[in-house]
């Protein structure tokens, strides 16, 4: 099984090392999740030709996957730490239903898919500790998420492959933007 950050053999061998700061821990956690996404994308791309052929095919989708915009304050121009942090946490909470959808979508990387999901939950907890304005964070409605999940799973095989590909691509982009923004905080 993939080893979560902070639990590798080097950590055990070096007990006198300085403990990670909150920011370092978050940074490491995101990079760990990004590694997991890379592995999942590799399986998706090997299994179907989604990665090359369909870049534009259904790019105009209505999945409404979380995405950074100028108004979110996460880009260098107009950077706003508090607004951005709220966007990152809200976005990750919205991604959770899509990460649930990814479970059972992988054969050889089943554990990796679970690791990405669980590590994202941990990342959300880290970030919530860092946020001052928790009231501004809206949590998705569980009933709506349950309906969404059912509908996603009812699609035909080709559309499910496409959905998997788009979720992984969007989640990777969202995490990369988050990582860049968090390094400015």
């Amino acid at each position: 099984a993939p080893v979560p950050p902070g639990e590798d053999s080097k950590d055990v061998a070096a007990p006198h090392r300085q403990p990670l700061t909150s920011s370092e821990r978050i940074d490491k956690q995101i990079r760990y999740i990004l590694d997991g996404i890379s592995a999942l994308r590799k399986e998706t791309c090997n299994k179907s030709n989604m990665c090359e052929s369909s870049k534009e095919a259904l790019a105009e989708n209505n999945l409404n996957l979380p995405k950074m915009a100028e108004k979110d304050g996460c880009f260098q121009s107009g950077f706003n730490e508090e607004t951005c942090l709220v966007k990152i946490i809200t976005g990750l909470l919205e991604f959770e239903v899509y990460l649930e959808y990814l479970q059972n979508r992988f054969e050889s990387s089943e554990e990796q898919a679970r690791a990405v999901q669980m590590s994202t939950k941990v990342l959300i907890q880290f970030l919530q500790k860092k946020a001052k304005n928790l009231d501004a964070i809206t949590t998705p409605d569980p009933t709506t998420n349950a309906s969404l999940l059912t509908k996603l799973q009812a699609q035909n095989q080709w559309l499910q492959d496409m959905t998997t590909h788009l979720i992984l691509r969007s989640f990777k982009e969202f995490l990369q933007s988050s990582l860049r923004a968090l390094r400015q905080m």
């Epitope: 259904l58 105009e60 989708n61 209505n62 999945l63 409404n64 709506t144 309906s147 969404l148 509908k151 996603l152 699609q155 559309l159 496409m162 959905t163």
Partner: nanobody, 125 residues
Framework: QVQLVESGGGLVQTGGSLRLSCAAS?????????TGWFRQAPGKEREFVAA????????YYTDSVKGRFTISRDNAQNTVYLQMNSLKPEDTAVYYC?????????????????WGQGTQVTVSS
Amino acid sequence: QVQLVESGGGLVQTGGSLRLSCAASGSTFSKHHATGWFRQAPGKEREFVAALNWSGGNTYYTDSVKGRFTISRDNAQNTVYLQMNSLKPEDTAVYYCAAGSYVFYFTVRDQYDYWGQGTQVTVSS
């Protein structure tokens, strides 16, 4: 139960314009809700024309109508419009309004749960 009623079809000459309306009643909107227009010419399959996401307002068109057709909405009236300009004989078809609460891909017909009866558009040369 959502009901869709189209209007605005008719006979028009090449280069002319028409505005189709689709009035929805009983709608429940999620952020994946979309309303679209499809068309079916005699002896052909029903094909996607244009669609609009209800919450975000983002729109999508099939290549053959880009720059000529515009899909828009009136939230207060629960109505979606299809403004069709520079009409061509190949636009002749029955135009159907469709809606779905969970439309993930605008062009995929079976993701729309509700359909109107259709309105005939005939473009004469």
